[in-house]
Each structure stands twice: as structure tokens, then as C-alpha cells.
Amino acid sequence: LDLSNVQSKCGSKDNIKHVPGGGSVQIVYK
């Protein structure tokens, strides 16, 4: 899955909360 063009708005995935789907996402993680 090539998501190299996705704009990341955070430094890492370390503090991603497990949400039930894309509808709960505030930003798109890289």
C-alpha cells in the first residue's frame, strides 16, 4: 500500500488511539 503521498501531521504512530474506523479519524497518519 503506497501512501508516500499522504501528508503526515504527526511525528509517529506511537500515540495513535485505536478508533473503530476512518470516520473517527481527525488527521491522516503517514
Epitope: 500500500l1 485505536h18 479519524v25 491522516v28
Partner: antibody, heavy 120, light 112 residues
């Protein structure tokens, strides 16, 4: 390369339980959700639930709540799906899939499937 | 629960001709904050595990031929194959991941 390798076929009696494993390799196990999807013979795909290995947090399809338990062992990069109180309608191929959590929420890699047959 | 409805359920096609599959959701799959539709398309070829074709409604997965195009937003989505090839036969599923996950019933594409 990313691989999801599932355990072998199982034959179970009605009322018993089955535990299917899914060993991941080729990526950081904790960074992706693992989803479980089943497919009864000649039928479509049905999502059962998922786990985020980093936290152990799970979500389940309401249809299976109370009967399915999904777990993950970070030390071996293995996810497990246990289904209890088996009935004949649970005869299906069970797939694990890597879910690109936090981005596309799409299942980009799938295991080979595990056939579970429930028969007396 | 979000319900996904595909049509048609069976689609006989002629090689070289176009094909189109519709997928409708019972509620919008568009996240206004990320501006993404959480809708994916999968193909399950006979005897194989499903494979990802399209995510975010219209983004082609790496390695997927450009004859496959996903479109739509909100509740109405379409997968188009510009020129069907023999290797495209199988069952196509749409899937929402806006809230949990739900698959459509599947559309069986077969050569006439």
C-alpha cells in the same frame, strides 16, 4: 516481504471452540490492525473483528460478540481468533488480514485462509 | 450498522468491453476532516484470498492495472473496468471502514 501465515485446517464438533493463528512477518506488527474475516461455502465475506496489537484493543462485529475473542502476541508477531460454541453454520474459511490502520483502513495483505469444518 | 448494497450481483462480460459495479452505503462514508471516503474494493479470484484493488474510494493500490477505476463519494460508489480481461474474473466486494467494517454482498464477474 509482508506475509501472513495461518494455521492449518480444523474439524470441530458442535459446541466446541476453535483457535486460529496468524503469524505476521515482513513489517512492524504493532503498527497495523489485524482483522479477521470469514467466508462460508459459496457465500460472501463477513468481518468478525480486529485487534490493534500495540495496545491489545479490540472491536468486534455485534453478531459475534460473546463468542469470538481476538488476541495478539507481540513477542511472536502472531494474532489469534478464537470462536466458541461452534455450530454447523460456522463452517467457513477464516482469513486474517493486515488493516492499514490510521490511513486508508484497507486490508492490503491477507493470509491464505483456514478452513474450519463444524460437524458431528 | 452500515449496510453495503452492491449491484448487479452477477455480471457476464465480454473481454475487451467495459464493466461497471455499483456500491451504495446506508450512510455517508466521507470524513469531512480528512476529506476521505472510507470505501475499498477487493477482488477475490477463484480459489484465492481477496486482494485489495482500490482504497479511499478512488486510489488504486500499487500494482493494480489502470483499467480499474474507483469513483464516488458519500453513499454512492462505482468500480469501473475499462476493458475486461480474462484474468479479471472473480467476485468483487466493496467494503466500508468508516465505522467498523462491512462488506457488500459481492458481484460475480464472469466471461460470457
Amino acid at each position: 516481504q509482508v506475509q501472513l501465515v495461518q494455521s492449518g485446517a480444523e474439524v470441530k464438533k458442535p459446541g466446541s471452540s476453535v483457535k486460529v493463528s496468524c503469524k505476521a512477518s515482513g513489517y512492524t506488527f504493532s503498527d497495523y490492525v489485524i482483522s479477521w474475516v470469514r467466508q462460508a461455502p459459496g457465500q460472501g465475506l463477513e468481518w468478525m473483528g480486529e485487534i490493534f496489537p500495540r495496545s491489545g484493543s479490540t472491536y468486534y462485529n455485534e453478531k459475534f460478540k460473546g463468542r469470538v475473542t481476538i488476541t495478539a502476541d507481540k513477542s511472536t508477531s502472531t494474532a489469534y481468533m478464537e470462536l466458541s460454541s461452534l455450530r454447523s453454520e460456522d463452517t467457513a474459511v477464516y482469513y486474517c488480514a493486515r488493516d492499514y490502520y490510521g490511513t486508508s483502513f484497507a486490508m492490503d495483505y491477507w493470509g491464505q485462509g483456514t478452513l474450519v469444518t463444524v460437524s458431528s | 450498522d452500515i449496510v453495503m448494497t452492491q449491484s448487479p450481483l452477477s455480471l457476464p462480460v465480454t473481454p475487451g468491453e467495459p464493466a461497471s459495479i455499483s456500491c451504495k452505503s446506508s450512510q455517508s462514508l466521507l470524513n469531512s476532516r480528512t476529506r476521505k471516503n472510507y470505501l475499498a474494493w477487493y477482488l477475490q479470484k477463484p480459489g484465492q484470498s481477496p486482494q485489495l484493488l482500490i482504497y479511499w474510494a478512488s486510489t488504486r493500490e500499487s500494482g493494480v492495472p489502470d483499467r480499474f477505476t474507483g469513483s464516488g463519494s458519500g453513499t454512492d460508489f462505482t468500480l469501473k473496468i475499462s476493458r475486461v480481461e480474462a484474468e479479471d474474473v472473480g467476485v468483487y466486494y466493496c467494503k466500508q471502514s468508516f465505522y467498523l467494517r462491512t462488506f457488500g454482498q459481492g458481484t460475480k464477474v464472469e466471461i460470457k
